[in-house]
Amino acid sequence: GELETSDVVTVVLGQDAKLPCFYRGDSGEQVGQVAWARVDAGEGAQELALLHSKYGLHVSPAYEGRVEQPPPPRNPLDGSVLLRNAVQADEGEYECRVSTFPAGSFQARLRLRVLVPPLPSLNPGPALEEGQGLTLAASCTAEGSPAPSVTWDTEVKGTTSSRSFKHSRSAAVTSEFHLVPSRSMNGQPLTCVVSHPGLLQDQRITHILHVSFLAEASVRGLEDQNLWHIGREGAMLKCLSEGQPPPSYNWTRLDGPLPSGVRVDGDTLGFPPLTTEHSGIYVCHVSNEFSSRDSQVTVDVLDPQEDSGKQVDLVSAS
């Protein structure tokens, strides 16, 4: 007869491991018992269990409640056992020793491999600001057995670097993603992808990039100076900028206080019916936690009567 087993049994942490051992005997041969032992190199054999043809399953106190026979129907020549709730410490070499009569004893070894799936974590780097050089955007760490693979999935241009730390029964892999921050990266996803044989599918953790910036400020509303004449209603100046975090706006007048009746509404400065009093230099001040910008414009309110008077003068002069 001969023993049938597997060279390697692979199981995920917490699952049950079936340790196979089947005696394929000649007719008339019987199995008296099957002894299972752990036989790691450098250590003596430690018995897990003994399956006795007459007196049933005996289990080592060290494995109490963890070793069972597979559910029925059972073949009397099958010496397989189930090791419940595999832990990392179970990884190693096991020996199945089958005592038969009249043929004698047979033994076979297998290796139990316990996969420890990783629990990845993503840590964002320091605050990203436009104008910085190459900066850490995020690091992703995953520990498992065997060592997991850590990669990045993103449309953002950057560089990655990985390092690995070996522990006694596992390995931790850390991958870092570096980039040169620019405003176009704002809101873009950066996804850490962890692959491992103990995972049914890759694990993904997504971090949304936030890059602090503040665009140059400009003022709109003075495109047609001729519209800024005495008596005009609904005149307004609008301050244009953008930033992350979103900026706040403040309006001042360089050559004095804001005239009465002028309304400040965030980025917009609204004027009552225009008078020459509204002529002056107006400053829009834009700021966020990252930076601040100023833009100034000169408002010159025209007096149509003055203009027509000049025209008459010019005509008469000709």
């Epitope: 008296g32 002894a35 018995e47 897990l48 007459k54 007196y55 005996h58 080592s60 005592s99 009569f101």
Partner: nanobody, 118 residues
């Protein structure tokens, strides 16, 4: 041939403890399982617990959690620690040894009486 000698029986109150010991001599190299059987009056002999040379154990459901078997292969002894004894544990307890050649218990001690009073 294997000779087995038990000791440690006696009378004990319900809830008490007793320890039985068994020493083997003779052809001890052929011993596989060692165990303890018991036989109450007018009942069949039953296997209480057995232990392999490698220390794997089996207990009858009726004694699980109360009885503990231990074996010293070097000294050829097997002990049975009995805790939380009940009147229904009253019986003659036999040490037994199983031969590697036969795979059944074929060597027996003379038996020791355990009486649990309520």
């Amino acid at each position: 041939e294997v000779q087995l000698v038990e000791s440690g029986g006696g009378l004990v109150q319900a809830g008490g403890s007793l320890r039985l010991s068994c020493a083997a001599s003779g052809s001890i190299s052929s011993i596989n399982l060692m165990g303890w059987f018991r036989q109450a009056p007018a009942k069949q002999r039953e296997l209480v617990t057995s232990i392999s040379p490698g220390g794997s154990v089996r207990y009858a459901d009726s004694v699980k959690g109360r009885f503990t078997i231990s074996r010293d292969v070097a000294k050829n002894t097997v002990d049975l620690q009995m805790n939380s004894l009940k009147p229904e544990d009253t019986a003659v307890y036999y040490c037994a040894a199983e031969s590697e050649r036969t795979y059944y218990f074929d060597s027996w001690g003379q038996g020791t009486q355990v009486t649990v009073s309520s």
